[in-house]
């Protein structure tokens, strides 16, 4: 008799793929307009990325550092009207994209939570949650919670409101902290909270260090659902050397949890891509017309248009990974096992029951090496085969689809591989 199938875990929509942050509408649209109506026109693009949720804003009225002039129930007219927002929600729903609204109160000001009047602000947030839930929003984000006094208890209260409305509503908290203990104390008091932090950007970007960060985090959080990003708001390029971008895309999409990206991460957008632009709001490079000030040779391969036409581009890799992440059970909710790793590299297996299994091998170093993978530290349920099929490499030149001998596996500098192999009873 065939072994009994494992019961599938309950999967919320944010478990099924990546979240995509658009913190600055003007930067994202890159055409000087930057409003909700314009954003609607980019939903097809977001669909093509197979992202499950759009983390939007903040877009509410906020007079810099003025509590009274901050209204979380009103959309800043520069971004559009409530009707525009309702229309965006409706269009997004049709494309199965959920909208998560950033309600960080004083986003234009010095201290995101104002330095005083914490209770007043917390009440405003509470009212806003109830208001926007009724309006059809799928979730909320609040950032810089290290600046919010008694953050844990407020988050618990806000979580109760969102979950009380529906189990299908999400609350994301963001912190600049990279300290595991601080992160854990925030998570402990809030079940189901998705927390973005600077935890991974605390890395020296070696395979050994990244492996220890990831495994420590997973061990400490137990079977709680994680999110993976390098910061609560910034671009990957602000934290990573360029040669590791592809590697991190592969890792973020294949670790157990929800990957969270900022607009532009999919094309390797850099914060100062266009001179004169503020670092926090880089202009999204849709095509060559996004380069009003520079005519850099090869600028086409930095744009969405250019990269869409190139199967070897970062954008193409992002799309492929996002697609795999959203449809393969082992990547959706599979178990995770790290393998013993050599210098500069980190490898792990994702597996779920009798479904196809995935092996990820990441070489963070700039020296090619023999990975020589052996299953010495794996449980029987996750045993390694002699060969696995190459699904993708982060670098050109590999023969995708071909079987690779795992004991003789050799990686190029900064290369990541995603391999697949079948369950064998």
């Amino acid at each position: 008799r065939a072994p009994r199938c494992r019961d599938l875990p309950v999967q919320k929509w944010w478990h099924t793929g990546a979240l995509y942050r658009i913190g600055d509408l003007q930067g994202f649209q890159g055409n000087g307009a930057g409003n909700l109506a314009g954003l609607k026109g980019h939903l097809d693009y977001l669909s093509s990325l197979k992202v499950k949720g759009l983390v939007l804003g903040p877009i509410h009225k906020n007079q810099k550092d003025d509590v009274a002039g901050t209204d979380l129930l009103q959309i800043d007219p520069n971004f559009g009207s409530k009707e525009d927002f309702a229309s965006l929600l409706q269009s997004a729903k049709k494309k199965s994209i959920r909208i998560i609204l950033d309600l960080t109160p004083n986003y234009q000001g010095e201290n995101s939570w104002f330095s005083t009047q914490v209770d007043t602000v917390a009440t405003k947030v509470k009212d806003a949650l109830e208001f926007w839930l009724q309006a059809g929003v799928d979730g909320f984000q609040v950032r810089d919670i290290e600046n919010l006094k008694d953050a844990s208890s407020f988050l618990a209260e806000w979580q109760n409101i969102t979950k009380g409305f529906s189990e299908d509503r999400l609350l994301i908290a963001g912190t600049n902290s990279s300290d595991l203990q601080q992160i854990l104390s925030l998570l402990e008091s809030n079940k189901d909270l998705l927390l973005t932090s600077s935890y991974l950007s605390n890395s020296s970007f070696t395979g050994e260090h990244t492996k220890s960060l990831v495994t420590q985090y997973l061990n400490a959080t137990g079977n709680r659902w994680c999110s993976w990003s390098l910061s609560q708001a910034g671009l990957l390029t602000s934290f990573l050397p360029a040669q590791l971008l592809r590697l991190y895309q592969l890792m973020l999409f294949t670790l157990p949890g929800t990957p969270v990206f900022s607009y532009g991460d999919e094309i390797g957008l850099e914060a100062a891509a266009v001179p004169g632009q503020p670092v926090e709001a880089p202009v999204m490079l849709w095509d060559e017309s996004s380069f009003p000030f520079i005519s850099a040779a090869g600028s086409a391969n930095m744009t969405v248009k250019g990269q869409s036409e190139d199967p070897g581009s970062l954008l193409s890799l992002f799309r492929r990974l996002s697609d795999q992440r959203s449809k393969e059970r082992s990547l959706l909710h599979g178990d995770f096992h790290a393998l013993s790793s050599g210098p500069g590299f980190f490898s792990y297996i994702r597996h779920w029951d009798q479904n196809e299994r995935f092996l990820v091998v990441l070489n963070f170093g700039d020296v090619g090496l023999s990975a020589g993978l052996q299953a010495s530290d794996l449980p029987a349920s996750a045993s390694l085969p002699a060969k696995a099929d190459l699904l993708l490499s982060t670098q050109p030149g590999r023969d995708e689809g071909s079987p690779l001998e795992l004991e003789r596996l050799k990686l190029e500098p900064h290369e990541g591989l995603l391999l697949r192999f079948p369950y064998v009873a």
């Epitope: 040669q243 050599g342 090619g368 090496l369 023999s370 050799k410 500098p413």
Partner: antibody
Framework: EVQLVESGGGLVQPGGSLRLSCVAS????????MHWVRQAPGKGLVWVSR????????RYADSVKGRFTISRDNAKNTLYLQMNSLRAEDTAVYYC?????????????WGQGALVTVSS | QSVLTQPPSVSGAPGQRVAISCTGN?????????VHWYQQLPGTAPQLLIY???DRPSGVPDRFSGSKSGTSASLAITGLQAEDEAAYYC???????????FGGGTKLTVL
């Protein structure tokens, strides 16, 4: 057939400069990391410098840091080594070397070498 | 003084087996970096003989084999032939020097 041909070697006085070139053929030059390795007369091999495929990642041996500069022109399939403030101990045959792919960063093809003599 | 230590010379009669050792430390071979071997015939440029500890490039006879264990590696040549007379170099990467390192070379004499 893979070929690496060095040129630019010669006699130079201490403190002087020299620029070595290496023209590559028989492979897609722009896809490979490249190295310079030297060998003093009657001695062993010593690694000098390495550059990645697009020129954005560069490494030097401590003995040449600040004096030598590696660069490449992928359009011309050419690797360069600019050597300044030369010393007597820099006297050697300089080999242009290709780093293999999927070989654990081994050095899979070597040029015939260019002799650099630093003497007054 | 080379970072990787090789015997300066080894010798053997035709048909015999010889082995050349290469000893490093925990920042190169012992750290898990690959060891490669090169053959340099008199008056010529070096040629890759073994890569990735034990793999042979095409064209290299199977009389040549490589192995690695801990902080050292070894090159074995069986069925020694006159044309094997050459200098042999091991090479790895060193993380503390952040560079490629070679052994001092071993001169093989076929008696």
């Amino acid at each position: 057939e893979v070929q690496l041909v060095e040129s630019g070697g010669g006699l130079v006085q201490p403190g002087g400069s020299l620029r070595l070139s290496c023209v590559a053929s028989g492979f897609t030059f722009s896809s490979y990391w490249m190295h310079w390795v030297r060998q003093a007369p009657g001695k062993g091999l010593v690694w000098v410098s390495r550059i990645n495929s697009d020129g954005s990642i560069i490494r030097y041996a401590d003995s040449v840091k600040g004096r030598f500069t590696i660069s490449r022109d992928n359009a011309k399939n050419t690797l360069y080594l600019q050597m300044n403030s030369l010393r007597a101990e820099d006297t050697a045959v300089y080999y242009c070397v290709r780093e293999g792919r999927y070989t654990g960063s081994s050095l899979d093809y070597w040029g015939q070498g260019a002799l650099v003599t630093v003497s007054s | 003084q080379s970072v990787l230590t090789q015997p300066p010379s080894v010798s053997g009669a035709p048909g015999q087996r010889v082995a050349i050792s290469c000893t490093g430390n925990n920042s190169n071979i012992g750290a898990g970096y690959d060891v490669h071997w090169y053959q340099q015939l008199p008056g010529t440029a070096p040629q890759l003989l073994i890569y990735g500890n034990s793999d042979r490039p095409s064209g290299v006879p199977d009389r040549f084999s490589g192995s690695k264990s801990g902080t050292s590696a070894s090159l074995a040549i069986t069925g020694l032939q006159a044309e094997d007379e050459a200098a042999y170099y091991c090479q790895s990467y060193d993380s503390s020097l952040t560079g490629w390192v070679f052994g001092g070379g071993t001169k093989l004499t076929v008696l």
